[in-house]
Interface confidence: medium
């Protein structure tokens, strides 16, 4: 019987998408490049379910992890790397007092049980996301 593998080896499947949790650390810009090199995108979160899933992955491993969110384009205006804005309903995920932009913190990370803004030149783990392969037929 032919087996279907919707995601590459070492990627995690969740609700139609594949996620790669890095084992090394890069700055935010280089994390974008790392995801692009494998045909993916630094993770853009589209639903509460996806957020809960990713936050759990990050907090379980006790890692500070980049996501594809920054206010580099305009200070205070948070935007995903696919160009979409951060919806008001997602602002609940910031940790208490965040984002605080202390010392030019323009890139978002998973930190503990929520999100934090931090300096984009810091090396952190990252999560890539791409659509899962279709297993129909």
């Amino acid at each position: 019987e032919r087996l279907c593998h919707p995601c590459p080896w070492e990627w995690t499947f969740f609700q139609g998408n594949c996620y790669f949790m890095s084992n090394s650390q890069r700055n935010w810009h280089d994390s974008i490049t790392a995801c692009q090199e494998v045909g993916a995108q630094l993770v853009v979160i589209k639903s509460a379910e996806e957020q809960n899933f990713l936050q759990l992955q990050s907090s379980r491993s006790n890692r500070f992890t980049w996501m594809g969110l920054s206010d580099l384009n305009h200070e205070g205006t948070w935007q995903w790397v696919d160009g979409s804005p951060l919806l008001p309903s997602f602002k609940q995920y910031w940790n208490k007092g965040e984002p605080n932009n202390v010392g030019e913190e323009d890139c978002a990370e998973f930190s503990g049980n929520g999100w934090n803004d931090d300096k984009c030149n810091l090396a952190k783990f990252w999560i890539c996301k791409k659509s899962a392969a279709s297993c129909s037929g």
Partner: antibody, heavy 119, light 112 residues
Amino acid sequence: QVQLQESGPGLVKPSETLSLTCTVSGGSISSYYWTWIRQPAGKGLEWIGRVFTSESTNYNPSLKNRVTMSVDTSKNQFSLRLNSVTAADTAMYYCARDRGTYLGGFDPWGQGTLVTVSS
Amino acid sequence: DIVMTQSPLSLPVTPGEPASISCRSSQSLLHSNGYNYLDWYLQKPGQSPQLLIYLGSNRASGVPDRFSGSGSGTDFTLKISRVEAEDVGVYYCIQALQTPFTFGQGTKLEIK
């Protein structure tokens, strides 16, 4: 509004090291790549390389063995060192902010500093 | 390295008339993320270059809407709908898909 200012000696002797500094004002150096580009008189532009942190750099292979870039976040400056210069390195040297893969483009640029290699 | 080729190298234009500059790359600049890593710059006489268009077709902040960028893959075009006297200078394309980033030779736009 971010502004960039190049500084360094305008005259360098052949075989010596060209050292330039770019000072960033009006914004933090922490969030972007920073790049160096040069232009010989009457000629086109050549990308020298870029730096994000001193451990994260990309250099033009045509210069790779001679070029070093670094960042000093405490001074909001980044620098270029080019070893073993010859007359072919005589050019206007520009520093610029590289907005990175996500935003794209070099913006803003410094006004440029002319470096002449001559004995 | 990716080679960038611009044409024409010289472009005399009457004010108020349109102008078009072509830029071709030796390999595709279209990334799987859908972006074309091609930017356009204008260097006015005696000045530093300034960003006009980034990621193929996005106008930089403060750039007049008479400037537009189009194309995908290996063929790109910068268009000026109505040339003004202040548009004179040398126009450069650059590929930012892979390092080393490489510029075209430049196109000198002058007023007839």
